[in-house]
């Protein structure tokens, strides 16, 4: 058993029908020494007198909310909360495998440039008597801060016969260099409880790893005369790290035609212009990616043919 | 990105063409070895990551863009002193910081030519011969050492008596590659500020 | 005392379909996800699918994916593995088990395909 | 097709000691629990040794298991007849998890 907060334990249980569960002790919190009573819940049951109770913790009807009292009096209360391990392995109930980029992807992480700000987000089915809270570090044996804000409740989508939630958090490196060469990952880690269940989570990367720059801003097309060619040019993003000259980008540009059976011409260039063939009812799109740094491409920014 | 890189100007920054292949040459190197050593911990999540570098040069504090030098999280600056001539330097005024700065590139470069090189030599003697460093990276090295052109001290080849420990040198392979590919980042960020400089 | 107990085996012509059924007691059951494994005759132990405690997620092997769906009814106490399209390599030993350190396992049910 | 590797056989007179190998990879034995199963004709599997080394309670002590890198093994010392069996381990890869890995089964005969 562990404290998770004041007043708030978790007990880890190994999971497994007829589980012989774990021994809790509570103590009352309070000077007093008799008259005590204890109960769990809304129940006004007496599970026991004194100022410690003993407990079999087995199976969530166990867990809850403990209460001493005196007299009708409230006198402390602490909060049992269960931590499943099921074959070794803590439980993943609380949140969605996203599968991406490999199963047991559980936090998503982003960040749009090298100012070691960064979004992360999860996805959950559970709408309700639901909380998170996120840490997070440079490492892990010496850790350097990293300021993590509440998540929030970032989007709900209907799949199938299922509500999903997605939740997101932002976080800031206390003191961070863009152009440093990372050689400790950053941490994230997130508590979750469901009702009486608490599970956590991690993921453990590199900023360089999680970039993805917004898409090129300020898309534009101009005719070339006499020619079925126009100039595309576009800017980078205003949330790239600068010099640009230092933190070069690299872009795709593509022409799309209306149906996406259509042959794609696709041209990569490191400069802010390129010459294309507009066909017609067609689109162009843009994208931008670290040029040094093969992490993943921005979304397209697109303008029509017409 | 396997698409044509254009070759620059002859005007250009003369390192910096170097400096692309460098990049491009390491990262290959990199994946042939995650590919070939698939049964190694060899990827960014299970090795070390470790600098040779550390505490002998210090390029990316003495190559840090001028923007960035208000920044007091890029200030962690070490006193290192470096040999001043080169030959990227010759058609371009420059100051004493990028000196400093290319120097360091060059002793980054000659740390990882030796140790790749002794590396080699232990891999040789594999029986497996299961992998070995691509020739075109050393060269890559080398060709980026001589546009620099700094003179410097030769480091000797290290050479082991003891038997080599196969397992011990991929798995130490794989931490020079990965360390060497983030630096080589680095080196290419660097020389495109300073082409445009 | 947990106690496990399949059904549903028997003999089917290749193509045809089967349902199997676990019958679980001395537990709650509606805590715990739930493993059908199976063992062709003289051969090793294969894992055929899992369900969480809840019925939320079904995990199936490769070799079953799009044939087999495993489900169960927590108010009924039962494991089921509904398996179509069912071939002579499906022919085995289906065990149900419990997920845990410590698993409990049925007797087995056999399923023979055979024309 | 198991990734979990076992020798086909083992065998031994009674009271000898026999080993049983397993051998998998970083994403399963290397980064999860092992646990071992007898199977004795027509009979479905019982647990044997559960987080890689512990025994759950019925097990003669004869039993043990062990855990290094990327295989484990078990040991039966003072062999008895009734020890004949097939042998299995058992273990999860951290990418399929829950999916239950299987060793490939160990034969283990009395002589």
């Known amino acids: 058993i562990w404290e998770l907060k004041k007043d708030v334990y978790v007990v880890e249980l190994d999971w497994y029908p007829d589980a012989p569960g774990e021994m809790v002790v509570l103590t009352c919190d309070t000077p007093e020494e008799d008259g005590i009573t204890w109960t769990l819940d809304q129940s006004s049951e007496v599970l026991g007198s004194g100022k410690t109770l003993t407990i079999q913790v087995k199976e969530f009807g166990d867990a809850g909310q403990y209460t001493c009292h005196k007299g009708g009096e409230v006198l402390s209360h602490s909060l049992l909360l269960l931590h499943k391990k099921e074959d070794g392995i803590w439980s993943t109930d609380i949140l969605k495998d996203q599968k991406e980029p490999k199963n047991k992807t559980f936090l998503r992480c982003e960040a749009k440039n090298y100012s070691g700000r960064f979004t992360c987000w999860w996805l959950t089915t559970i709408s309700t008597d639901l909380t998170f809270s996120v840490k997070s570090s440079r490492g892990s044996s010496d850790p350097q801060g990293v300021t993590c804000g509440a998540a929030t409740l970032s989007a709900e989508r209907v799949r199938g016969d299922n509500k999903e939630y997605e939740y997101s958090v932002e976080c800031q490196e206390d003191s961070a260099c863009p152009a440093a060469e990372e050689s400790l990952p950053i941490e994230v880690m997130v508590d979750a409880v469901h009702k009486l269940k608490y599970e956590n989570y991690t993921s453990s990367f590199f900023i360089r790893d999680i970039i993805k720059p917004d898409p090129p801003k300020n898309l534009q097309l101009k005719p070339l005369k006499n020619s079925r060619q126009v100039e595309v040019s576009w800017e980078y993003p205003d949330t790239w790290s600068t010099p640009h000259s230092y933190f070069s980008l690299t872009f795709c540009v593509q022409v799309q035609g209306k149906s996406k059976r259509e042959k794609k011409d696709r041209v990569f260039t490191d400069k802010t212009s390129a010459t294309v063939i507009c066909r017609k009812n067609a689109s162009i799109s843009v994208r931008a990616q670290d040029r040094y740094y093969s992490s993943s491409w921005s979304e397209w920014a697109s303008v029509p043919c017409s | 990105r396997n698409l044509p890189v254009a070759t620059p100007d002859p005007g250009m920054f003369p390192c910096l063409h170097h400096s692309q292949n460098l990049l491009r040459a390491v990262s290959n190197m990199l994946q042939k070895a995650r590919q070939t050593l698939e049964f190694y911990p060899c990827t960014s999540e299970e090795i070390d990551h470790e600098d040779i570098t550390k505490d002998k040069t210090s390029t990316v504090e003495a190559c840090l863009p001028l923007e960035l030098t208000k920044n007091e999280s890029c200030l962690n600056s070490r006193e290192t002193s470096f040999i001043t001539n080169g030959s990227c330097l010759a058609s371009r005024k420059t100051s004493f910081m990028m000196a400093l700065c290319l120097s360091s590139i060059y002793e980054d470069l000659k740390m990882y030519q030796v140790e790749f090189k002794t590396m080699n030599a232990k891999l040789l003697m594999d029986p497996k011969r299961q992998i070995f460093l691509d020739q075109n990276m050393l060269a890559v090295i080398d060709e980026l050492m001589q546009a620099l052109n700094f003179n410097s001290e030769t480091v000797p080849q290290k050479s082991s008596l003891e038997e080599p420990d196969f397992y011990k040198t991929k798995i130490k392979l794989c931490i020079l590659l990965h360390a060497f590919r983030i630096r080589a980042v680095t080196i290419d960020r660097v020389m495109s500020y300073l082409n445009a400089s | 005392q947990v106690q496990l107990v399949e059904s549903g085996g028997g003999v089917v012509q290749p193509g045809a379909s089967l349902a199997l059924s676990c019958a679980a007691s001395?537990?709650?059951?509606?805590?715990?996800?739930m493993h059908w494994v199976r063992q062709a005759p003289g051969k090793g132990l294969e894992w055929v699918a899992f369900i969480r405690y809840d019925g939320s997620n079904a995990y199936y092997a490769d070799s079953v994916a799009g044939r087999f769906t495993i489900s169960r009814d927590n108010s009924k106490n039962t494991l089921y593995l509904q398996m179509n399209s069912l071939a002579a390599e499906d022919t085995a030993v289906y065990y149900c088990?419990?997920?845990?350190?410590?698993?409990?396992w049925g007797q087995g049910t056999m399923v023979t395909v055979s024309s | 097709q198991s990734v979990l590797t076992q020798p086909p056989s083992v065998s031994g007179a009674p009271g000898q000691r026999v080993t049983i190998s397993c051998s998998g990879s970083r994403s399963n034995i290397g980064s999860n629990t092992v646990k071992w199963y007898q199977q004795l004709p027509g009979t479905a599997p019982k647990l044997l040794i559960y987080?890689?080394?512990q025994r759950p309670s019925g097990v003669p002590d004869r039993f043990s298991g062990s855990k290094s890198g990327t295989s484990a093994s078990l040991a039966i010392t003072g062999l008895q007849a009734e020890d004949e069996a097939d042998y299995y381990c058992?273990?999860?890869?951290?990418?399929?998890?829950?999916?239950?890995?299987f060793g490939t089964g160990t034969k283990v005969t009395v002589l």
């Open positions: 987080y890689n080394d």
């Open positions: 088990k419990t997920h845990g350190s410590h698993d409990n």
């Open positions: 001395g537990f709650t059951f509606s805590s715990y996800g």
């Open positions: 058992q273990s999860y890869d951290r990418y399929t998890h829950p999916a239950l890995l």
